[in-house]
Interface confidence: medium
């Protein structure tokens, strides 16, 4: 087991007294059934807490809510419910925080039985609110334009799309029978509409529309649309192919002006596509297998989102609730973890270090034994619990956690064996982006990263007993100290820390309950006195990411370059600080075949780095439709992996000739696109066709 509070561990001196002086309790005197917490701005210390209490009486729901505000990272709260005239705020999508550091907040009130609704707007980090009546009832949370926080978009419960250009002061109806709407870049709005009036029955008969001028004019950019999604610089649409119920993915990189058909298998009505991750370079696309298999195939795209390479087969993605374990490890470039459904129906974790090029099992932690699932007690792997385990009811209180500014650190629940175990999971930590793992904590815990990895905090999950202890580590999870933050245990509901892992404050939320009384309570602990001094140059050490063989000249090369990082020494107990910036030194690598993906019409046989021609395309001219022109491809089978920066070395030749022939990407050709102007406006929003999960860019 991992070192605990024993002689091996360097204990932090006088930590109990230091933490006791910096532990702040706040009691919320209301009986609300739920509490939601929102951070307003970055490094502002402002937190809004909404408590809601709802009771269904006959056909209507009576509810009340209270609003609290903190401006010191949760140490103290002030009841500001009177600022919103004691109005009941919706708990499901009631608080909408503006992008970046705009200081904007929109609260959506629940005005039962009304044809309209009401919002409260703040532009000063929730110090003051202005009440505004809405001419519609929102169906979902009001959406800010990422580029301009004054521009708001809303979908109504009557399938109408509404826009405001002055932060909710005045609203214009853009369109009717809109099923889904999203902000794109440059204040562009994309939406699907159905002239037949229904969003639920007619998927596959939708039209995709775009307005680049907030509703003055509209352009039809696609028809026979089943669904659409945005990922990175790519716009995707799944389009009915005309062959019965089959649909295919089309992709655009110019906001829908031109489309190309993605080289992906078409899917039937019982299947789905899902963008697992996307950036400006490439896309991870999951394509569901036919039938109720619960798995599919991950494909990785080229830089245009058109040519795809098979990345991982039997990828677990349940059709029922849409659970997948796919996780982007943000603390190290190119690393992703997910699960496969093996032939024997067991669930197994896989990891890639090169953006989906190769997948392997996770290395068994040194300090762990293989569990009962292992056929060989010496040979087994670490298996990570994520969304699928949570959905199946296992005691997994948190998803895997990583932060871009806490380089190399990954924290996750897991089990060690041949497959994921249904036994009680433990907490494992990697300090090198998933190459090696250590068992850090026995049993399930809530955890969070503070001060860019300088501190890791955990609270044991204990559903049946109260909680009064917090554990923390200053050496990336090697050693843990325990601090009793209260004498009387609380029913623990969760940890809260400012997004971005730069804060040194952690809030422990829970409630106390007696026969006659129940109330919410928070304990906010500031670790500033534990990390007494600012880190200096001597506290950091040079670390080569992705290093597996220090003797090899190309050691650490991933996607054509290697990176050396300055990382905090485990033995250093100091503050990285709020302004900490990850220091890295990249160096370019020579190209090898590993830096290329197989081009259109080629594939890689298993365990081979060479790309060979697909038998069915041998001897054929490779012609395909790209941006509405027929292209002729001259290739020896390779295309540079998106984001790969290698130079020199192997350099396969590739040429694309424009055949100057018009062609159409199925149903999305430019000539079939219509424009129109709209003097007045009218709009609409319907059912949520595409749900967006925490880590998933787009699921049909």
């Amino acid at each position: 087991s991992a070192p605990g509070e024993d002689e091996e561990c360097g204990r932090v001196r006088d930590f109990v007294a230091k933490l006791a002086n910096n532990t702040h309790q706040h009691i919320f005197n209301d009986l609300s059934g739920s509490v939601s917490l929102s951070w307003v701005g970055d490094s502002t210390g402002v937190i809004l807490v909404l408590t809601t209490f709802q009771v269904p009486i006959f056909m209507i729901t009576i509810g009340q809510s209270k609003l609290y505000r903190s401006e010191d990272y949760g140490k103290n709260f002030k009841d500001i419910t009177d600022l919103i005239n004691n109005t009941f705020i919706r708990s499901d999508f009631g608080i909408a925080i503006g992008p970046e550091n705009s200081g904007k907040v929109v609260l959506t009130a629940d005005v039962s039985g009304s044809h309209g609704s009401r919002i409260f707007r703040s532009s000063d980090f929730a110090k003051n609110f202005v009440q505004q009546e809405l001419p519609f009832v929102p169906l979902m949370q009001i959406m800010y334009s990422p580029q301009n926080s004054d521009y708001l978009l809303a979908l109504s419960n009557k399938n109408e799309l509404w826009v405001s250009k002055n932060f909710g002061g005045k609203w214009e109806k853009l369109y009717d029978t809109v099923c889904l709407a999203k902000w794109g870049s440059d204040n562009t709005i994309f939406f699907t509409a159905n002239h037949n009036g229904s969003c639920s029955n007619d998927r596959g008969m939708l039209e995709l529309w775009r307005t680049s001028d907030l509703g003055k004019s509209f352009k039809t950019i696609g028809s026979k649309i089943y669904s659409f999604g945005l990922g990175g610089r790519f716009l995707f649409a799944s389009v009915m192919t005309g062959k019965g119920t089959l649909r295919a993915i089309h992709v655009s990189t110019d906001q829908g002006d031109t489309w190309s058909m993605a080289q992906l298998p078409p899917v039937g009505h019982e299947q789905f596509y899902s963008i697992l991750a996307a950036n400006d370079d490439m896309v991870f696309m999951h394509v569901d297998e036919p039938g109720d298999s619960g798995f599919g195939t991950i494909f990785t795209s080229d830089d245009r989102g058109i040519v795809y390479s098979k990345s991982l087969e039997r990828h677990l993605y349940t059709t029922t609730g849409g659970e997948t374990d796919f996780t982007n490890v943000t603390s190290l470039r190119g690393v992703y973890i997910t699960s496969i459904l093996a032939e024997d129906k067991s669930v197994q974790s896989m990891i890639t270090f090169d953006q989906g090029g190769r997948w392997t099992h996770l290395r068994k932690p040194e300090n762990s034994k293989c569990d009962a699932t292992a056929r060989d007690p010496e040979k087994c792997s670490l298996h990570i619990h994520a969304a699928y385990s949570i959905a199946t009811g296992l005691n997994v209180p948190m998803l895997p956690l990583s932060e871009p500014n806490a380089v190399g650190i990954v924290i996750a629940h897991g089990s060690v064996g041949d497959a994921i175990s249904v036994m009680r999971p433990d907490v494992y930590i990697s300090d090198d982006g998933g190459y090696s793992w250590t068992k850090a904590l026995e049993g399930p815990h809530h955890y969070t990263i503070l001060d860019s990895g300088g501190i890791i905090v955990a609270v044991e999950q204990n559903a049946h007993q109260g909680v009064n202890q917090i554990k923390f580590s200053t050496d990336e999870g090697q050693c843990w100290q325990t601090y009793n933050f209260t004498k009387d245990p609380i029913f623990f509901t969760g940890l809260a820390s400012e997004p971005g892992a730069r804060s040194m404050n952690i809030s422990i939320w829970g409630y106390r309950s007696s026969l006659f009384h129940q109330y919410w309570i928070s304990y906010t602990i500031d670790f500033k006195d534990i990390l007494e001094r600012n880190c200096e140059e001597k506290d950091y050490t040079i670390w080569l990411a992705h290093s597996t063989d220090p003797e090899d000249y190309e050691d650490g090369c991933i996607l054509g370059y290697k990176e050396q990082f300055l990382r905090l020494r485990k033995s250093s107990v100091c503050q990285n600080g709020r302004d900490y910036v990850v220091t890295k030194q990249p160096s370019i690598c020579l190209c090898s075949l590993e830096d290329f993906l197989c081009d259109f019409g080629y594939y890689r046989p298993e365990n081979d780095s060479k790309c060979v021609e697909q038998p069915e395309l041998k001897g054929h001219d490779l012609e395909f439709c790209l941006y509405g022109r027929e292209e002729h491809l001259t290739t020896n089978g390779y295309r540079k992996i998106p984001g790969d920066k290698c130079q020199g070395g192997v350099n396969p030749v590739r040429e694309v000739k424009d055949l100057k022939k018009k062609c159409t990407s199925n149903f999305l050709s430019p000539e079939k696109q219509n424009s129109k102007s709209n003097g007045s406006a009218g709009g609409s929003g319907g059912l949520n066709d595409i749900f967006e999960a925490q880590k998933i860019e787009w699921h049909e």
């Epitope: 009557k158 002239h195 037949n196 009036g197 039809t220 129109k676 609409s684």
Partner: antibody, heavy 117, light 108 residues
Framework: EVQLLESGGGLVQPGGSLRLSCEAS????????MSWVRQAPGKGLEWVST????????NYTDSVKGRFTISRDNSKNTLYLQMNSLRAEDTAVYYC???WGSGFDYWGQGTLVTVSS | EIVLTQSPATLSLSPGERATLSCRAS??????LAWYQQKPGQAPRLLIY???NRATGIPARFSGSGSGTDFTLTISSLEPEDFAVYYC??????????FGPGTKVDIK
């Protein structure tokens, strides 16, 4: 069963006004785009105007723009066509139609509008 | 504006024969084209929408094909009740429509 019943037609002098109504039943009226189509005696069909489900978007054939106004009252399941500055060439049977796909799947029986002095 | 041209203007056939009606658009209308049948004194009846989809209750002898600018309505074997005027109609935008001039199918 879907039913569309037009009313309000009749004889009117050039320059006069009429308001046509179309009462809908048998379907969720507010969910559907609705249109008016006319047919002059012995002639073909001519699309006149269309309105979206919520009433926010409307369009007209060029010859009636500025003179005709399409509207709807979803609480009454009724479609309207307000016709002002009527001309002799507006004489026709006016049909109310429910949109479906690229076409109109249900039509009323029509109401005759005669513009004559 | 998009103009629809129908040909022939009149088609004289006998029951049991195959009828092929053509509709051409002045520019592409994708697959947004519908066909109607109209008998004297009656409202039009939708036969085909979105170029090739049969409307509810329409017999299988009616079929539509084409996309872009050229469309065809085919009646595989004429029944006595099929003699009527047939109109094509396009939807070039969400709320903009135009009809063709019609083709009269009469008994030879």
């Amino acid at each position: 069963e879907v039913q569309l019943l037009e009313s309000g037609g009749g004889l009117v002098q050039p320059g006069g006004s009429l308001r046509l109504s179309c009462e809908a039943s048998g379907f969720t009226f507010r969910s559907y785009v609705m249109s008016w189509v006319r047919q002059a005696p012995g002639k073909g069909l001519e699309w006149v105007s269309t309105i979206s489900g919520g009433g926010g978007n409307t369009n007209y054939t060029d010859s009636v723009k500025g003179r005709f106004t399409i509207s709807r009252d979803n609480s009454k399941n009724t479609l309207y066509l307000q016709m002002n500055s009527l001309r002799a060439e507006d004489t026709a049977v006016y049909y109310c139609a429910k949109n479906w796909g690229s076409g109109f799947d249900y039509w009323g029986q029509g109401t005759l509008v005669t513009v004559s002095s | 504006e998009i103009v629809l041209t129908q040909s022939p203007a009149t088609l004289s056939l006998s029951p049991g024969e195959r009828a092929t009606l053509s509709c051409r658009a002045s520019q592409s209308v994708s697959s947004y084209l519908a066909w109607y049948q109209q008998k004297p004194g009656q409202a039009p009846r939708l036969l085909i929408y979105d170029a090739s989809n049969r409307a509810t209750g329409i017999p299988a002898r009616f079929s539509g094909s084409g996309s872009g600018t050229d469309f065809t309505l085919t009646i595989s074997s004429l029944e006595p009740e099929d003699f009527a005027v047939y109109y094509c109609q396009q939807r070039s935008n969400w709320l903009i429509f135009t009809f063709g001039p019609g083709t009269k199918v009469d008994i030879k």
